[in-house]
Every structure is written in C-alpha cells, then in structure tokens.
Interface confidence: low
C-alpha cells in the first residue's frame, strides 16, 4: 500500500481467482483513543471499532472511502484504490492502446518546436468517474523539472457503437535548452483513476523525436508567363523555433490530381518556393520537416491549381 | 578553418559537409524511430558520448559571442564518433559492406573534423570508452545506439554550421 495523495491510498493486488489479497491497517487521524467506529462509503454498517481497523483487501468491494467517527462526528477519511496485477503485468483497462507507432502505446506526445513545450494525449471509452494526474521530468535518476497543466477532455468521437474520448495535457520543460543535444529523455507519467481502479501509464522520449512542425503558412501560387508552370511559395509556420537560419526546415511539394489514382509529382527543397507544373483540377500541397533530424512531417498545407 | 582564439571556419564548406553527415547518419540507420532503444538499458553504453550541452555556446547567441567554445565541442564529438565508427564495434562481425553508408559516414566525420582543425594544432579530445561487446548481436544493438546518438549530435552540428554560414560568414 502506498499514498497517492493525502488520504488516498493505492493497494497493489495480484489479481487471480481466490487470491489471498492484501492485509491493510487503517489508522484514524485523531488524538482520540476511545469510542471510535469505522464505516465504508455511504453505509452506516459498523465495520469495527478502535483507533485502527484491519481489513483484508481482495476485490473492488473492499475498496472505497473508509471513515472513522466518534459520537456521530467524522474524524478522518482514507480512500482505498486498487491497482491490479494480472500475470505479473499491471492492468491497462482505462486507456485504449493507440497501436501507433507500436503496440502498447497508450500515451502519444508531440512538440511543434524545440522550446521544451509538448502536448500528450490519450484515448478512453470511459465517460464518467474518471480523473487523471500528469507528472513529467527530464531524466529519472536525477530528475529535472517539467511542469504540466491539468489534463482536459479535448475531443469526443463516435467509433462504431462506442464513444471515444480524447484527453490531452500540455507540458513545458522548466529550463528548456532548444539548441542543446538532449542526453536524457523526458519522462511522462499519467495516473488514471476510474471509480476505485488505479492505473499508471508512462512514456519516455526526446523532444527531437516527437517534433512535428505545423504546416507551412501563406501558401501561394504565381503563374509563370506563357507556361503551365507556377511558382509556389510559402513561409515557415509561426510556431516553429527561430532563428530559421539555425532551426531550418526542409519541404516536400506535391502536385495531386483529383483522383487518388493519378500519379503524384513530388519535389523536395530547402527553399521556401518551388516551380511545378499545375495540372487542371489538381491541387498543390506542401509539408515541412526538420531539415537535419528525421522526425515527423507536418500535415499538408494545400491550394487548388485553378 | 577554426583556429582557437583566431579566425573563422569555412562556414559554407562545414555547412555542406554537416548536412551530408545528417543524410548519411539517417541512411545508415533509417528505421531507428520504430525501435525504442532506451528499453535495452543503454546507460552503460552511450552515456560516455560527448553531448552538445546548454553551456557549450552552440546556440545562436553563443555563436555570435564566441564560436570557438562550440566548435571545440563539435570537433571533440566528431573525433569521438570517427573513432567509434572505426572501432571493432563497426569493423567486427556482422561485417559491413565497404561502401555502406557507415563507411561514407566515417570518411565524412574525418573530413569535417579536419576542416575544423588545421594540422599542427590539437584540441583536447575525449577518450572513447572501451566498448567491445562479445556477441555479434550485442554489437549490432550497440551500432544502432551509437548511430542514434550520432544522428542527434550531427543535427545540432548542422544547425550550428547553417547558422554560421548564414550569419557569421565574412
């Protein structure tokens, strides 16, 4: 048993049929010694008396808010949550496996630049009685500070018969150093509580590996005289790290016909303009990637040829 | 060429070569994003590599103030990785083809380090750790880790030279 926060405790249980469970001793937080009784949740049934209560925690029915009283007055509470371990593996019932970029990916994170600010998100099909708490640091043995905000519900989607909820959180490294080469990864830890079930999820990454620039902005076409060619121009996204002479991007320009089956023409360039042939009913798209480190490409910015 | 306390390097040449290094480092080990190498407990293997740290003056402001601190750190790293790529880790079994990206990478690391340091002058270099894995599979894993680390190092070096070429070239 360990303390998650004040008056909230997590009991770690090996979860299998007829498991013996865990013996837990609760102590009433009071100077009083006599006349103390214990109840669980909303029930008025007295579970025991005395300053301490010993219980055998085996299942969710044994978890909940234990309260000690004296003469009708509440003295203190202890909320017990369960953390299940099945076949030596902690349960991951609350969050959905996103399977990208690999199996058992419950948390996904992205950064728009090297400022030390990043966003993580996760999915669940649970709609109520759900709380999350996020902590982060750089390195684990001698952690350096990363400050995370509160996790918020950022999207709801219907997937077949199920509703899926996306939660996200923004974090910022306290002493970020955009120009440095990271040697210790960022660690993100999410505590998830659904009713009386506790689970924790972690992710470890370097900012450089989760970089995904915003799409290029101000994408414009300029027809070239007496030619089917056009000059495409664009600008770095506002959110990208500066100066651009240092934090440089590379770009991919694509000409795509109306039909998905049509051949795509692609040009790669480090410049913020390119000359391409504009076919009828086609569209021109541009995306960006860090010039020197192969992290994710941005989403496409597109304009129609006509 | 970068002479400590003295003249500037050939920023444009360094920029071109460092950008080539980036390309080679990724072609030598392109699928790295799909392997979480940190899960293999790499503390003892890549902890000793020289990193370009916050105080090394490799940020735009630091380069403007005095690029020598940064160039010295980059030079140390280039020599370090050049030695690693020439060591038993990469030359032993399973053997690499003579014209593999790793071989080209090795040559380019040497080329850039020579651009930064003229003959006759020696900046202190970091000792390479004695890593000689006994099993070929361990060697393979260690190669991945070293190349992964090199990708991050050369990315910072390339940014430095690109910025230098754009803002500090005579």
């Amino acid at each position: 048993i360990w303390e998650l926060k004040k008056d909230v405790y997590v009991v770690e249980l090996d979860w299998y049929p007829d498991a013996p469970g865990e013996m837990v001793v609760l102590t009433c937080d009071t100077p009083e010694e006599d006349g103390i009784t214990w109840t669980l949740d909303q029930s008025s049934e007295v579970l025991g008396s005395g300053k301490t209560l010993t219980i055998q925690v085996k299942e969710f029915g044994d978890a909940g808010q234990y309260t000690c009283h004296k003469g009708g007055e509440v003295l203190s509470h202890s909320l017990l949550l369960l953390h299940k371990k099945e076949d030596g593996i902690w349960s991951t019932d609350i969050l959905k496996d996103q399977k990208e970029p690999k199996n058992k990916t419950f948390l996904r994170c992205e950064a728009k630049n090297y400022s030390g600010r990043f966003t993580c998100w996760w999915l669940t099909t649970i709609s109520t009685d759900l709380t999350f708490s996020v902590k982060s640091s750089r390195g684990s043995s001698d952690p350096q500070g990363v400050t995370c905000g509160a996790a918020t519900l950022s999207a709801e989607r219907v997937r077949g018969d199920n509703k899926e909820y996306e939660y996200s959180v923004e974090c910022q490294e306290d002493s970020a150093c955009p120009a440095a080469e990271e040697s210790l990864p960022i660690e993100v830890m999410v505590d998830a509580v659904h009713k009386l079930k506790y689970e924790n999820y972690t992710s470890s990454f370097f900012i450089r590996d989760i970089i995904k620039p915003d799409p290029p902005k101000n994408l414009q076409l300029k027809p070239l005289k007496n030619s089917r060619q056009v000059e495409v121009s664009w600008e770095y996204p506002d959110t990208w790290s500066t100066p651009h002479s240092y934090f440089s991007l590379t770009f991919c320009v694509q000409v795509q016909g109306k039909s998905k089956r049509e051949k795509k023409d692609r040009v790669f360039t480090d410049k913020t303009s390119a000359t391409v042939i504009c076919r009828k009913n086609a569209s021109i798209s541009v995306r960006a990637q860090d010039r020197y480190y192969s992290s994710s490409w941005s989403e496409w910015a597109s304009v129609p040829c006509s | 060429r970068a002479v400590p306390g003295g003249s500037s390097p050939a920023w444009t040449q360094c920029q071109q070569l460092s950008q080539k290094l980036c390309t080679l480092a990724w072609s030598a080990h392109p699928l790295v994003g799909h392997m979480d190498l940190r899960e293999e407990g790499d503390e003892e293997t890549t902890n000793d590599v020289p990193h370009i740290q916050c105080g090394d003056g490799c940020d735009p402001q630091g380069l403007r103030d005095n690029s020598q601190f940064c160039l010295q750190r980059i030079h140390q790293g280039l020599i370090f990785y050049e030695k690693l790529l020439g060591s038993d880790i990469f030359t032993g079994e399973p053997s690499l083809l003579p014209d593999s990206p790793v071989a080209q990478l090795h040559a380019s690391l040497l080329g850039l380090s020579q651009l930064l340091q003229p003959e006759g002058h020696h900046w202190e270099t970091q000792q390479i750790p004695s890593l000689s894995p006994s099993q070929p599979w361990q060697r393979l894993l260690l190669r991945f880790k070293i190349l992964r680390s090199l990708q991050a190092f050369v990315a910072v070096a390339a940014r430095v030279f690109a910025h230098g070429a754009a803002t500090l070239s005579p």
């Epitope: 952690p143 306290d174 002493s175 240092y246 | 105080g55």
Partner: antibody
C-alpha cells in the same frame, strides 16, 4: 541598471509562515529565472528552488518540497517565496537571485549561474 | 545530491600573494555548470566565474577559474585588500543546485 529589491526583515513564531518578496526594477523580469537561496547565521549558502516568471513553473529542492512555495507576478515584476511550518533552524538571510535566460526568437535556454542578487531578507524564527 | 567540498576552509595570506582555492565534486560536473562567488560580511554573494573559467562582467583579470570533471580551482594571482572575503563554488549541473561550504581568505 537592473536591481532586485527584497522586502524587510521578519520575526516569526515557530509553526507560522513567512512570505518574502523580491521586486525586479529596470529590466525584463520574464527573461530571467529567479532562484531563492538562504544562508543561516555563520553558515554557507543553500538553494531552495526557482521559478520561471514567464511560464510560472516552479522547481523546488527536495529538502523544501511541501514547505516552500515560489510564485511570481509578472505584472509587478515581483517574485515571492513562502516558507511554512517554520522552525528555529529556518532562521536565516533569504536571498533572491537572478539567472539569465539566453533569449533568441522567443525561445529560451538557462544560464544557471546567479549573476544578480537581492540584498537579502533576515527571517528570525523565535518563540 | 552533488556534494561540493572546498579546501582549505581558511586561507591566511598577505596582499600581493597568490591564492589557490579548490572545489571538489562528489560526482562529475559539466564545466558549463560550475560557478564561483565572492561574499563579504553583511553583503550578498557576487558572481565571479561561470562555466568554470569565464569571468563575469566587471571581474578583474586577477581572478581565474579552471578545472573539469570533479576538480575545479579558483586562482587569485595577486591578492588586493578588497579580495579578503569568503568564496563559494556552486554547481547547477544537477538539481538541487549545491554550493561548497566556502573558503575564507583572511589577511595574515
């Protein structure tokens, strides 16, 4: 010329709290980190924690975790350090100290040496 | 935590003499994160050296810093009357940032 001006001396009872302020005048407050360092009479220097006034993110030394709260008010260019559950061994001079951020293009990196210090605030804890 | 041990605790010298102050770390500290401060009685500390060897603005050339890894040195080439004070080394490589216990340079 940038200066860090701290609030005046305080005498406190054991178990109470103290809140010391540190006002930056004549410079950009948000482009610095503010650390708090204390020095017991005749003793050495002890770092307590820091804040990035721009982002509001505070980081505390483990020793003071739970007892210290560092905050900043960008509008008044003032940082605060509150220490609770005071005991006699908390009697010390409390300094605020600035660490510059290297700034370029809106992003920052820390230069973690303390290049500017407040004049110090003596906090005496006595019953 | 990284422990910084300064030696000697007290250094008794005359004006004009050379002072050598040592700072030893319990584990390796990047030289980018080692600084030296001077403190006089009743005053706040003053930054002298950062990145182990760079002089802070306005610090006279007689102060110099050196070292790497676990061993760092502050040298005052020729002591001036105003240099008699307590000197602290500090690391900001790892949190918590720690200071040495100080070396007092006093007039002989």
């Amino acid at each position: 010329q940038v200066q860090l001006v701290q609030s005046g001396a305080e005498v406190k009872k054991p178990g109470s709290s103290v809140k010391v302020s540190c006002k930056a005048s004549g410079g950009t407050f948000s482009s610095n980190y503010i650390s708090w360092v204390r020095q017991a009479p005749g003793q050495g220097l002890e770092w307590m924690g820091l804040i990035d006034p721009n982002f509001g993110g505070a980081y505390y030394a483990q020793k003071f975790q739970g007892r210290v709260t560092i905050t900043a008010d960008e509008s008044t260019s003032t940082a605060y350090m509150e220490l609770s559950s005071l005991r006699s061994e908390d009697t010390a001079v409390y300094y605020c100290a600035r660490s510059k951020k290297g700034m370029y293009g809106g992003w920052t990196y820390p230069l973690m040496m303390f290049d500017l210090w407040g004049q110090g605030t003596l906090v005496t804890v006595s019953s | 935590d990284i422990v910084l041990t300064q030696s000697p605790a007290t250094l008794s010298l005359s004006p004009g003499e050379r002072a050598t102050l040592s700072c030893r770390a319990s584990q390796s500290v990047s030289s980018n994160y080692l600084a030296w401060y001077q403190q006089k009685p009743g005053q706040a500390p003053r930054l002298l050296i950062y990145y182990a060897s760079r002089r802070a603005t306005g610090v006279p050339a007689r102060f110099s810093g050196s070292g790497s890894g676990t061993d760092f040195t502050l040298t005052i080439s020729s002591l001036e009357p105003e240099d008699f004070a307590t000197y602290y080394c500090q690391q900001t490589s790892n949190t918590p940032f720690t200071f040495g216990q100080g070396t007092k340079v006093e007039i002989k």
